[in-house]
Each structure stands twice: as structure tokens, then as C-alpha cells.
């Protein structure tokens, strides 16, 4: 009975996600056979989050809306380890929107999920950000500095990175 009700709960949870994510890749968390963490296929997983690299070129606002439709946000980077994981899946000749913007042009940077912007955990390229009209952040590769952030115009189409919490079933 217990296993049956657990299975029913799992199925109903899976149905919630089916509209946007017809396929999930799940792994067993720890030793308990009943705890599974999942990411949509073909998203990648790191710690408690799932990541998707969107190769379509869109403006920042459209990129965020696109992530939102999938139950995600543009990526919020919280640690160097997280950034190191993300860049493994990026192409060096491309730029990708982050979930970081300064809509007022006053250098009050804000993350899309309201995570407080912490100047000590930022990875701007040297000399960046450098233009009050460039109100959205990308991550890109510079041969001198490897991967880092740059401010650019929000309306300029770029690739993007979506992030969502893992689905636990």
C-alpha cells in the first residue's frame, strides 16, 4: 500500500512536468531507493540544479521568457564551482545571457530570482561592466582571461543558459 501510494504520487508529479518536459533523466539520491532527483532530458545536472544551453539567438527578455516557459530562469551563478561546471558545456566563440540585469542603468545589478547581488561572488572580465546602456550580462570567453562576464545591450540576440531546481520524485 505504501509503495502503491508513493508510485501514484510520483506519477502525478511527473504529469505536472510532462507538458514542457516529456522526458526526465532521474538518479537515485543517496541510499534510499525511494528518493530520486530528476532533470529534463537533455538538461545537465550539478548539485541541486538542472541546466539547459539554449542555442537559439534571442534578446535577454525573450530568453528569460523562454526559460520561464520551461519552469526555469536564466542562470543565476552563485559560486565559482557552479560557473566551472557551466562552462564545460559552452562554446568559446559564443556568448550566453545570464539571469543578471541592470534595467535602470544605475549599476544596481539584480538576479532574476531575487538572489542578492554579491560583488564578492562575481566573475566580470577586467574592465567590465563598462557601459550604462549595456544593462544585461553575458558569459563569454576571452583568450586573455578565459571565461567571464560582460555587460551588453539587452535587445541584442544571444544564446542563453536556463537553470531550474531539480525535480524530486
Amino acid at each position: 500500500n505504501f509503495m502503491y501510494s508513493k508510485t501514484v504520487k510520483r506519477l502525478s508529479k511527473l504529469r505536472e512536468y510532462q507538458q514542457y518536459h516529456p522526458s526526465l533523466t532521474c538518479v537515485m539520491e543517496g541510499k534510499d531507493i525511494e528518493d530520486w532527483s530528476c532533470c529534463p532530458t537533455p538538461w545537465t545536472s550539478f548539485q541541486s540544479s538542472c541546466y539547459f544551453i539554449s542555442t537559439g539567438m534571442q534578446s535577454w527578455t525573450k530568453s528569460q521568457k523562454n526559460c520561464s516557459v520551461m519552469g526555469a530562469d536564466l542562470v543565476v551563478i552563485n559560486t565559482r564551482e557552479e560557473q566551472d561546471f557551466i562552462i564545460q558545456n559552452l562554446k568559446r566563440n559564443s556568448s550566453y545571457f545570464l539571469g543578471l540585469s541592470d534595467p535602470g542603468g544605475r549599476r544596481h545589478w539584480q538576479w532574476v530570482d531575487q538572489t542578492p547581488y554579491n560583488e564578492n561572488v562575481t566573475f566580470w572580465h577586467s574592465g567590465e561592466p563598462n557601459n550604462l546602456d549595456e544593462r544585461c550580462a553575458i558569459i563569454n570567453f576571452r583568450s586573455s582571461e578565459e571565461w567571464g562576464w560582460n555587460d551588453i545591450h539587452c535587445h541584442v540576440p544571444q544564446k542563453s543558459i536556463c537553470k531550474m531546481k531539480k525535480i524530486y520524485i
Epitope: 527578455t61 534595467p103 557601459n131 546602456d133 544593462r135 545591450h153 535587445h155
Partner: antibody, heavy 121, light 111 residues
Framework: EVQLVESGGGLVKPGGSLRLSCAAS????????MSWVRQAPGKGLEWVST????????YYPDSVKGRFTISRDNAKNSLYLQMNSLRAEDTAVYYC??????????????WGQGTTVTVSS | DIVLTQSPASLAVSPGQRATITCRAS??????????MHWYQQKPGQPPKLLIY???NLESGVPARFSGSGSGTDFTLTINPVEANDAANYYC?????????FGGGTKVEIK
């Protein structure tokens, strides 16, 4: 007072070239993105190209990509549009416009009087 | 590209009356309460002039007879009351993404 003055228009044969200029005054030119917008006779407005304040970004619609090049000289407070391989459908009044950023986008807050380009054999 | 459709293409209004122009976008030009739709007036032989930015903000020096509203895909420019020198073409423009696009224009004539 903000002023934008275009020049360089004229009559040119199909396949020919023209270079338009826009002289800016009354504001810190180097701090603003700039655009060219055109208007064919009796028609509406069509955006032609954009250049960012720092010259790091240029953008064109497919209709002019590869034929037109926007550039700027911040030391001379000047904006340029080099137009090559001109076609009859490029005939229009060409306006230089200043961009003012607002939130995630921008609008054109000042426009020049325009310069007329006629492409005809 | 985002397509902007203006209606009507033309309208004739008597002085003192209200003129209403609408602009419909092929997709939303709003994001988190910011509406990136702008309105311009163009009189014959003159360049366009900014009237309204971000859907409802009146540009400095523009009479309060002009107002804008709307969100998402549907926006309106209202002139109330209309005066004789309001005869012009009016254009909407979006800037939420490149390329920036303009509506086809609405010609306002004064009866």
C-alpha cells in the same frame, strides 16, 4: 540644444555607392548609441542600422546587410553610413537618430532633418 | 521580427474631439511591468518627433493632450482634445528586441 545634421545624399545609379554623414552637437556624442532610419517616398519608417556608443556593436536588417556599413568617429562627433551596391528600393530620406536607453530597450529621442538618396538610372 | 500593425490607417477628426490610434504587436513587448512601445509624430516635410516613450510616458515639451496606454501586445495613443496642428502621421515603435520595428503609420486629418 541637441542637433543632428545629415549630409551626403544625392542621385546615384544602381550599383553605385554613397557615404552619408551626420554631424552631432549639443550633447556628449560618445555616450549615445546612434541609428539610421529611412523613409521611402510616401511610405513609413524603416530602421536601417545601429551602432553602440562604444562602437562595440553594429546591427543591420537583412535588406541592407553586407551592403551598408555604419561607423562613427567620436572625436569628430560624427556618424556615417557607407552604402554600396545601391538599388532602386534604397531610394528614401535617410534620418540620423539618437538612441536613449530605457529599461531593456531604447527609443529615438532626437532626429536629424534627413538627407535624400535617389537611386535611378 | 516583431510586426506592429496600426489602425486605422487614417482618420479624420474635428477640433475638440478625441482621436484614438491603436498599435498591435505580433508578440508581447512588455517585460516585468515595462512596456517597450513608443510613439512618434511626423508632419509633412519634417522628421519624426518623439511623443510618448515606454507606452505612457510623455516626452518633455509634448502637450498633455497626448497620452499613451497599453501593455503586452495592445497599445493606444490618444489625442484629446485634437487641435488643428495635430494633423500628421503617427507611428508606433517597439524596442524590446532587435530589429527595432515601426508600425505602418496612421494619418490624422482635421475636419
Amino acid at each position: 540644444e541637441v542637433q543632428l545634421v545629415e549630409s551626403g545624399g544625392g542621385l546615384v545609379k544602381p550599383g553605385g555607392s554613397l557615404r552619408l554623414s551626420c554631424a552631432a552637437s549639443g550633447f556628449t556624442f560618445s555616450s549615445y548609441g546612434m541609428s539610421w532610419v529611412r523613409q521611402a517616398p510616401g511610405k513609413g519608417l524603416e530602421w536601417v542600422s545601429t551602432i553602440s556608443s562604444g562602437d562595440s556593436y553594429t546591427y543591420y536588417p537583412d535588406s541592407v546587410k553586407g551592403r551598408f556599413t555604419i561607423s562613427r568617429d567620436n572625436a569628430k562627433n560624427s556618424l556615417y553610413l557607407q552604402m554600396n551596391s545601391l538599388r532602386a528600393e534604397d531610394t528614401a530620406v535617410y534620418y540620423c537618430a539618437r538612441q536613449l536607453y530605457y529599461s531593456y530597450g531604447y527609443y529615438f529621442d532626437y532626429w536629424g532633418q534627413g538627407t535624400t538618396v535617389t537611386v535611378s538610372s | 521580427d516583431i510586426v506592429l500593425t496600426q489602425s486605422p490607417a487614417s482618420l479624420a477628426v474635428s477640433p475638440g474631439q478625441r482621436a484614438t490610434i491603436t498599435c498591435r504587436a505580433s508578440e508581447s513587448v512588455s517585460f516585468h511591468g515595462t512596456h517597450l512601445m513608443h510613439w512618434y509624430q511626423q508632419k509633412p516635410g519634417q522628421p519624426p518627433k518623439l511623443l510618448i516613450y515606454a507606452a505612457s510616458n510623455l516626452e518633455s515639451g509634448v502637450p498633455a493632450r497626448f497620452s499613451g496606454s497599453g501593455s503586452g501586445t495592445d497599445f493606444t495613443l490618444t489625442i484629446n482634445p485634437v487641435e488643428a496642428n495635430d494633423a500628421a502621421n503617427y507611428y508606433c515603435q517597439q524596442s524590446i528586441e532587435d530589429p527595432p520595428t515601426f508600425g505602418g503609420g496612421t494619418k490624422v486629418e482635421i475636419k
